[in-house]
């Protein structure tokens, strides 16, 4: 027998998802103690049977990695946590319906910024996710979001900005002054699902122009 939590043993049961890594988190309520233990179950939307998550039974930490169990990004899932404290009845709380495609946030991209004399090249590296293809390959964000694109900005002294946007991975800001420091920022966006990552930021200085030394 489980009851709805009126005892303040369990609060804020929710998924936190980033780049399709889906972590179930919760807080102990004011009535929880150091001996309160938590057990996690999950199920696919539309199914009746709850499945116990191995490794997240009678645990004391307040998180559980459900990435593998909720890895189908086209499906909806639920999870629930049952809290048990010495001498009291078990208390269960369930998440809202969860879809990693809708709810995941996007991390900043991994970028290499390469200074040249009069330009700065930016190479965006594909972001791997835990989502697997049918043949077992890890999918990149680009392979999941058709509309994914990169927004690149280059700042000079807070006064001047250059912009580039595109779906390719290689970019170059041209016509820059040699031996000058620039601040680059690169963001991932997916318009349809209105996702926007925090920017990757690189501070980079164009190379000095050595050609005068040979004239």
């Amino acid at each position: 027998h489980t009851t709805v939590d009126t005892s303040g043993l369990l609060q804020h049961v929710k998924f936190q998802s980033s780049n399709f890594e889906n972590i179930l988190t919760w807080d102990g309520g004011p009535a929880s103690t150091s001996d309160t233990v938590y057990s996690v179950e999950y199920k696919k939307y539309g199914e009746r049977k709850w499945l116990a998550k191995a490794g997240c039974q009678r645990i004391t930490q307040k998180f559980c990695n459900l990435t593998m169990e909720t890895r189908n990004h086209t499906e909806f899932y639920y999870a629930k946590v049952t809290a048990v404290s010495a001498g009291g009845p078990p208390v269960t709380k369930m998440t809202d319906r969860f879809s990693s495609l809708q709810h995941t946030t996007i991390k900043p991209p991994d970028v290499t910024c390469i200074p040249k004399v009069r330009s700065i090249q930016m190479l965006v590296h594909p972001t791997l996710t835990p989502v697997l293809s049918e043949d077992g390959h890890q999918l990149t964000l680009e392979e999941i979001f058709h509309d994914l694109f990169y927004r690149l900005e280059l700042h000079v002294n807070h006064t001047y900005q250059m912009h580039l946007e595109g779906k390719q991975r290689e970019y170059e800001f041209l016509g820059l002054t040699p031996d000058t420091e620039f601040l680059g920022s690169i963001t991932i966006l997916t318009p349809i699902l209105s996702k926007e990552s925090a920017p990757y930021v690189c501070r980079v200085k164009t190379l000095p122009d050595r050609t005068w030394a040979y004239s």
Epitope: H137, E143, D147, G166, Q168
Partner: antibody, heavy 117, light 107 residues
């Protein structure tokens, strides 16, 4: 060199079915976005469907949802379009195309689909 | 869906003329606008991407401008080989949509 070669077009009655194929070579087919685009006689171009060959994620234009199915055989580097419940307004030249390095720059020569009684 | 309105639908030009084709989107598409050229019986050829970036191998008489909702393709001096249909394409979000096309003919 990137090559896309469509086949499978023909004359079909309204309500009938056709399966188009697109044989691809010269690029990494198993990790790409592949498209079907059509052009009705004397009309503009219309994107019909897209699939990511690795994730299997698909999108369709509203007018073909529930009737057309896009799929791939990655072992054979081939893209398919299964077209059911065909209507006269589906009459068009059907092209396959791919996105490489962010750009939709490679197209097949097209295959003619005519829906008529 | 994003609708692309292209104008004019056709135009007559003399060799050497400056020709301008415009495309308007029903919502902002940033710079996710490409221009394609299509000759009868041929597949579309990419001329300009990112609203203003010329595809490799495309003559410099072609240029593109614009961002947001309004875009322009200009041919600074029309040559005989430029007589064709031109389409704009928004590549911002699915479904990707083309303008209705502009047929450039000889006056």
């Amino acid at each position: 060199e990137v090559q896309l070669v469509e086949s499978g077009g023909g004359l079909v009655q309204p309500g009938g079915s056709l399966r188009l194929s697109c044989a691809a070579s010269g690029f990494t087919f198993s990790s790409s976005w592949m498209y079907w685009v059509r052009q009705a006689p004397g009309k503009g171009l219309e994107f019909v469907s897209v699939i990511n060959t690795r994730s299997g994620i698909t999108h369709y234009v509203e007018s073909v949802k529930g009737r057309f199915t896009i799929s791939t055989d990655n072992a054979k580097n081939t893209l398919f379009l299964q077209m059911n419940s065909l209507k006269s307004e589906d009459t068009a030249v059907y092209y396959c195309a791919t996105r490489i390095q962010g750009l939709i720059d490679y197209w097949g020569q097209g295959t003619q689909v005519t829906v008529s009684s | 869906d994003i609708v692309m309105t292209q104008s004019p639908s056709s135009l007559s030009a003399s060799l050497g003329d400056r020709v301008t084709i415009t495309c308007q989107a029903t919502q902002s598409i940033s710079t996710f606008l490409s221009w394609y050229q299509q000759k009868p019986g041929q597949t579309p050829k990419l001329l300009v991407y990112g609203a203003s970036r010329l595809q490799t191998g495309v003559p410099s008489r072609f240029s593109g401008t614009g961002s947001g909702t309004k875009f322009t393709l200009t041919i600074s001096g029309v040559e005989a080989e430029d007589l064709a249909s031109y389409f704009c394409l928004q590549d911002y979000s699915w479904p990707l949509t083309f303008g209705q096309g502009t047929k450039v003919e000889l006056k």
